[in-house]
């Protein structure tokens, strides 16, 4: 029979290549039986995972699975890194595998503002 433990369906060593400036939704697929567990996202910093308290998250419910979504609106260059979701269930902590975001900064050297543009828009220097 199907297990009634909470299960988090993030693949081990999974990766996403995304562009800075675009919106992106990072999904944590969650399977549970009765009560939906409390789920959080954290970002790995070395061996510790720093909880993302102030980020926009939401739930998407489907028939056999639910998704706890971390929203990036938009993706920033420093969103690069590894993320993990965790579920609290009957005083057990269940951790997913980590998933890595590789952020490409579209403001590559060839697309940087010209000197003329910088002169007329000096705030670009401080973005």
């Amino acid at each position: 029979k199907e297990s009634c433990d909470v299960q988090l369906y993030i693949k081990r060593q999974s990766e996403h290549s995304i562009l800075a400036g675009d919106p992106f939704e990072l999904e944590c697929p969650v399977k549970y039986c009765a009560n939906r567990p409390h789920v959080t996202w954290c970002k790995l910093n070395g061996t510790t995972c720093v909880k993302l308290e102030d980020r926009q998250t939401s739930w998407k419910e489907e028939k056999n699975i639910s998704f706890f979504i971390l929203h990036f609106e938009p993706v920033l260059p420093n969103d690069n890194g590894s993320y993990r979701c965790s579920a609290n269930f009957q005083s057990n902590l269940i951790e997913s595998h980590s998933t890595t975001l590789y952020v490409t900064d579209v403001k590559s050297a060839s697309e940087r503002p010209s000197k003329d543009e910088m002169a007329s828009r000096p705030w670009l220097l401080y973005r």
Partner: antibody
Framework: EVQLQQSGAELVNPGASVKLSCTTS????????IHWVKQRPEQGLEWIGR????????KYDPKFQGKATITADTSSSTAYLQLSSLTSEDTAVYYC????????????WGQGTLVTVSA | DVVMTQAPLTLSVTIGQPASISCKSS???????????LNWLLQRPGQSPKRLIY???KLDSGVPDRFTGSGSGTDFTLKISRVEAEDLGVYYC?????????FGGGTKLEIK
Amino acid sequence: EVQLQQSGAELVNPGASVKLSCTTSGFNIKDTYIHWVKQRPEQGLEWIGRNDPANGNTKYDPKFQGKATITADTSSSTAYLQLSSLTSEDTAVYYCASYEGYYERFGYWGQGTLVTVSA
Amino acid sequence: DVVMTQAPLTLSVTIGQPASISCKSSQSLLDRDGKTYLNWLLQRPGQSPKRLIYLVSKLDSGVPDRFTGSGSGTDFTLKISRVEAEDLGVYYCWQDTHFPYTFGGGTKLEIK
């Protein structure tokens, strides 16, 4: 019933390309990683790379980078291995393998495809 | 790359006797999630490989319990408590902790 059905044997000319297929059934291909493995005659196994059909992300052994291209089509539950600029060194049996990505719960192998590079 | 070294190269065993295969990795296979991603495969003559053991010691469904996997870090062992005729073939260890994933050179089990 779980199956990984690989395409038939190929005899190809040096310098040509070939595209092998691996059609999966009995599980959701998006829940797995698809690996491709090379086995030269009477030799051991060499890992070529793996594809995540859920998002297309692919990792290669650097020695196969530029030689191999791994893709997957989730609508047909089929994975592909394309080999380019073929030489006699590429004569081998190529296996696809599907490993569950979350909890390692299964690891299935196809029957293999023999590629012979010869003029 | 992680080098996987298997020993012995060939193993001749009498039916009903035990067998043991060693696999050593050039670096630890302990992943940051606390698990060790070491598989054992059997390739019977003329067939494709088949996974026997994953995560060092977990048996695949349908694999007889005469097979046991053990070890940690860089040292791993596959044991067969009583060899049967269907066990002949080449055994490979395979690590999928570090990219690129790598196989051992194989150990051929022959029946005496």
